[in-house]
Interface confidence: medium
Amino acid sequence: QAAPFPELCSYTWEAVDTKNNVLYKINICGSVDIVQCGPSSAVCMHDLKTRTYHSVGDSVLRSATRSLLEFNTTVSCDQQGTNHRVQSSIAFLCGKTLGTPEFVTATECVHYFEWRTTAACKKDIFKANKEVPCYVFDEELRKHDLNPLIKLSGAYLVDDSDPDTSLFINVCRDIDTLRDPGSQLRACPPGTAACLVRGHQAFDVGQPRDGLKVVRKDRLVLSYVREEAGKLDFCDGHSPAVTITFVCPSERREGTIPKLTAKSNCRYEIEWITEYACHRDYLESKTCSLSGEQQDVSIDLTPLAQSGGSSYISDGKEYLFYLNVCGETEIQFCNKKQAAVCQVKKSDTSQVKAAGRYHNQTLRYSDGFLTLIYFGGDECSSGFQRMSVINFECNKTAGNDGKGTPVFTGEVDCTYFFTWDTEYACVHHHHHH
């Protein structure tokens, strides 16, 4: 049986059940290389509390559909008196990056995971030429996830004192040059994740090969190398390589740009101080508030919730968007879709789509940006579930009793963007983390 998601095959992936202190290793095409789980384990569970290993999915006992991968075992388990076998179930959803498998829950018999990934899309519009895993767990099993930094088009400019060259990078995947409105990035060779531009020429100085690595819990490293044997004439016989070190800052701060810290014989060392390098629980919440010592800040958007069936309305040219954030109030127009953001076509109000659901909510504060994300909406033709990204700005004089109102700023590939000026986005900072 052919591997269902070939682009995920090259790596062993990790997921964590934080509540029970369990680390899972997953290899969806072969077996994980862990002796204690046996030679054919596709999903190996490491219980750090008891220091034991169990195979909870066998690579030989795999069954697959386009959106579900199941690995059975021959190990019996007792679930309400019936004689089942231990198994792992991975539900796949279309995403814009390779993404990460997320542990959902585990019963006596079944270990459930969910994975939003380009590999599960119906169309190839989000697929990279080359992409590597962009997250890592530290020794305390805390997740550091750089997926939000991945650019689907364009690149980051590296801050460099050399006026004659510009070094552009992407994170964990190659630079998509096709959407560049000018010639600056178009000259970059396909597959490059680090592109050096000199005048009208562009050179590949690194492609992604290995996934993100953790050096210390506040430092992550990504390495790009130029694979082909052909040397560049200005590299003195050396093969180009780029090392990006992502540093979690010691306290809350605005984002910085990637900076070139060393350059010798086409070996480029880049340091990027960004809160995305910090563990995810420092940046994100599933509720509408971020507070406590863990996050160093106090943010509470719950006063923005609307009651009594009313919603915020945002005008988007062909569509009206109805928003009801930070609550579980049904939007009247949205046909019991559990939508936090509802898209209604102006010319045909029967065309209603959920652009993100209220139980699929993430609040993130990173690098000075406060963002509320609703995902899991109705599918687009690519298979990607509509989502909404609301970028908040602090405005102490916002109208509507300080609440302000969301403004639609655009749509890209079924992701809807809004900005929202409100006094409730004014962040209160605490002490160091």
Epitope: K151, S153, G154, A155, Y156, L157, D159, S166, F168, R179, D180, P181, G182, S183, Q184, L185, I257, F369, V389, N391, E393, T409, G410, E411, V412, F417, T419, D421
Partner: nanobody, 123 residues
Framework: DVQLVESGGGLVQPGGSLRLSCAAS????????WGWFRQAPGKEREFVAA????????SYADSVKGRFTISRDNAKNTIYLQMNSLRPEDTAVYYC????????????????WGQGTLVTVSS
């Protein structure tokens, strides 16, 4: 590619105000970062202001901070530059530009340009 057309330039007295507009058509308006640049006679093109497409984050050249404001109307695919307290040294051709490179004020990283609109500040 994106096509950009600037308007709103003209002659204004020192201390006066002007509002420049830049209408975009062609490829999706919402994937780019937007900038205003200017070029005075005999000088290099210089950065004035920029706005990120996915949020309201803006940046300004030190020489215009507090006097100029960049903004955007996504429904009209238009960006604006509100210029207050104009000075003779603001006299230049003002250009609107689009880029998909983040964190840049370098004109060479902006791929699409308008034809420019002349602003003259003189008594």
């Amino acid at each position: 590619d994106v096509q950009l057309v600037e308007s709103g330039g003209g002659l204004v007295q020192p201390g006066g105000s002007l509002r420049l507009s830049c209408a975009a058509s062609g490829r999706t308006f919402n994937t780019y970062n937007w900038g205003w640049f200017r070029q005075a006679p005999g000088k290099e093109r210089e950065f004035v202001a920029a706005i990120r497409w996915s949020s309201s984050k803006t940046s300004y050249a030190d020489s215009v901070k507090g006097r100029f404001t960049i903004s955007r109307d996504n429904a009209k695919n238009t960006i604006y530059l509100q210029m207050n307290s104009l000075r003779p040294e603001d006299t230049a051709v003002y250009y609107c530009a689009a880029s998909i490179v983040d964190f840049t004020t370098n004109p060479s990283h902006f791929g699409s340009w308008g034809q420019g609109t002349l602003v003259t500040v003189s008594s």
